[in-house]
Amino acid sequence: LQDLCSNCPAGTFCDNNRSQICSPCPPNSFSSAGGQRTCDICRQCKGVFKTRKECSSTSNAECDCISGYHCLGAECSMCEQDCKQGQELTKKGCKDCCFGTFNDQKRGICRPWTNCSLDGKSVLVNGTKERDVVCGPS
């Protein structure tokens, strides 16, 4: 017996209760590929997430993070708090970079200043919490 489900396009599911006819996905659900036996629940962008792309019958919703947060993980699976430049996020919140380190972004960790002397160069511009040192000529 031919499997009629393979004829069901994206946006539908193969309804075994209706002799394998293709039924439309219910509201707030989708199927991105043909031949599916069920639809998938749409992702809901709530809390620190905001909707970047609405769910449709053929594709899931896509989320971004609200202002003050940035995405982490595949498909923005998590939102992490932004810090100011010159800071890094710790378990206790945003903390200033220690002397000798910098962070020029609102995310990520503080990194050590470049050691100019390793390349036989001198420091042309001193580093700050927000900026790396600038090495001058040797």
Epitope: D15, N17, P26, P27, N28, S29, T38, D40, I41
Partner: nanobody, 122 residues
């Protein structure tokens, strides 16, 4: 056993109104996501309207927004679809539907009734 019994269809002129009813048994309308699908002659099923999130939100197809209103009477365990400003393209068999959420995240729906015919014609 889940049963859905639709009524209220009929022949109506363009611009007219109808109210469809769906008497449910075997489950509680107020505790489920429920709605209406329709099948026009020679066409596939189409979602018309639904009450979602246990009543927290409603869905309307673009083609019926502002003309159709979905509601329910918890005491009577009945779902309604108030249809106004009806058009020829609303002609279809209307089915009451219960959205089913499966373990593992899948979503389908059940239509157990025979449906009710709505014909919009002058």
């Amino acid at each position: 056993e889940v049963q859905l019994l639709e009524s209220g269809g009929g022949l109506v002129q363009p611009g007219g109104s109808l109210r469809l009813s769906c008497a449910a048994s075997g489950f509680t309308v107020s505790a489920e996501d429920v709605g209406w699908v329709r099948q026009a002659p020679g066409k596939g099923l189409e979602w018309v309207s639904a009450i979602l999130d246990k009543g927290g939100s409603t869905y309307y197809a673009e083609s019926v927004k502002g003309r159709f209103t979905i509601s329910r009477d918890n005491a009577k365990n009945t779902l309604y679809l108030q249809m106004s400003s009806l058009r020829a393209e609303d002609t279809a068999v209307y089915y009451c539907a219960r959205i089913v959420y499966h373990a593992g995240g899948g979503v389908t729906f059940d239509t157990r009734g025979q449906g009710t015919q709505v014909t919009v014609s002058s």
